[in-house]
């Protein structure tokens, strides 16, 4: 989404980003759309510090993040590079289990009850987290 100078009401500011934590559950695509309508995106986890922050706020409930492999390779919704980026998968995950007959495998990533990541079928009604970046320019000293 576009950058902001301050976080919207009911969003939590952390390290120059704003986060909104859902209480209800939605399928991944519906959650993704919800965040986009808020001029944001599903959360993109880029560091262990950010992982701990999100984990603290979501508690022990499966929660969608902005990571999927619905078109082949794993991709973050904001374009952050998956291969070189932070990862926190559970052991043996992602397993991309193909037995569900949905076409493709388990294509969407979520935080599990212990915070580590798992891939699951995208229609599951999990909570989700939206993220949007604060206006970085407003954080810098003005040019003289």
């Amino acid at each position: 989404g576009s950058e902001r100078a301050c976080c919207p009401v009911n969003w939590v500011e952390h390290e120059r980003s704003c986060y909104w934590f859902s209480r209800s559950g939605k399928a991944w695509a519906d959650a993704d759309n919800y965040c986009r309508l808020e001029d944001a995106h599903l959360v993109v986890v880029t560091s262990w510090e950010e992982q701990k922050f999100v984990q603290h706020h979501i508690g022990p409930v499966n929660t969608w993040m902005g990571l999927h492999d619905q078109n082949g390779p794993w991709k973050w919704v904001d374009g952050t590079d998956y291969e070189t980026g932070f990862k926190n998968w559970r052991p043996e995950q992602p397993d991309d289990w193909y037995g569900h007959g949905l076409g493709g495998g388990e294509d969407c990533a979520h935080f599990t009850d212990d915070g580590r990541w798992n891939d699951d079928v995208c229609q599951r009604p999990y909570r989700w987290v939206c993220e949007t970046e604060l206006d970085k320019a407003s954080q810098e000293p003005p040019l003289l």
Epitope: S24, H100, G101, L102, Q123, R124
Partner: antibody, heavy 120, light 107 residues
Framework: QVQLVESGGGVVQPGRSLRLSCAAS????????MHWVRQAPGKGLEWVAV????????NYADSVKGRFTISRDNSKNTLYLQMNSLRAEDTAVYYC?????????????WGQGTTVTVSS | DIQMTQSPSSLSASVGDRVTITCRTS??????LAWFQQKPGKAPKSLLY???SLQSGVPSKFSGSGSGTDFTLTISSLQPEDFATYYC?????????FGGGTKVEIK
């Protein structure tokens, strides 16, 4: 042991209201999602509603949406189903059932059921 | 909504028989399938979840298998206490939906 006991059923006229209760014991109620499932006489099982462990998420079957409300009081270990604008087709045995997790993990423990009859 | 179709709707079998009940879903449901047993006048009892995982206290003569849209419940050696109606249920997404039931009767 884990136990669910429903109450509040009875005979009611069409258009009237009824509130069912489900008293839980033997487990940490506030950690589990809860469901209502019903069974019309001689018919199969029909899921009615779910409420997540903390009350944050509620979902309903289309057949009851806008008429029934699921709620819970974790301090009293009790689940409720408020049924308004009752119809003859709501006649059934109503079961409360525990979710295996917070609300999206399927059912494991069931109550014995309470009978609701909607008739004029 | 996801439709659940059970077959057969009823079957007659003898003690000791191996019985198989099939559940077909209108779309893939991942591993989010459960089986329940219900005896007349009683509440349903959970047998299996996640297709093949036995609920605590359920004997191993009950087993589940399948993937995609086709699932089966097998009772390896039918005993008198197993004569009942069996239901499959998907819990991949809301609304949760049940199959129409399979009544297992004594031959």
């Amino acid at each position: 042991q884990v136990q669910l006991v429903e109450s509040g059923g009875g005979v009611v006229q069409p258009g009237r209201s009824l509130r069912l209760s489900c008293a839980a014991s033997g487990f940490t109620f506030s950690s589990y999602g809860m469901h209502w499932v019903r069974q019309a006489p001689g018919k199969g099982l029909e899921w009615v509603a779910v409420i997540w462990y903390d009350g944050s998420n509620k979902n309903y079957a289309d057949s009851v949406k806008g008429r029934f409300t699921i709620s819970r009081d974790n301090s009293k270990n009790t689940l409720y189903l408020q049924m308004n604008s009752l119809r003859a087709e709501d006649t059934a045995v109503y079961y409360c059932a525990r979710d295996q997790g917070v609300g999206y993990d399927g059912l494991d423990v069931w109550g014995q059921g309470t009978t609701v009859t909607v008739s004029s | 909504d996801i439709q659940m179709t059970q077959s057969p709707s009823s079957l007659s079998a003898s003690v000791g028989d191996r019985v198989t009940i099939t559940c077909r879903t209108s779309q893939g449901i991942g591993k989010y399938l459960a089986w329940f047993q219900q005896k007349p006048g009683k509440a349903p009892k959970s047998l299996l979840y996640k297709v093949s995982s036995l609920q605590s206290g359920v004997p191993s003569k009950f087993s589940g298998s399948g993937s995609g849209t086709d699932f089966t419940l097998t009772i390896s050696s039918l005993q008198p206490e197993d004569f009942a109606t069996y239901y499959c249920q998907q819990y991949m997404t809301y609304p949760l939906t049940f199959g129409g039931g399979t009544k297992v009767e004594i031959k």
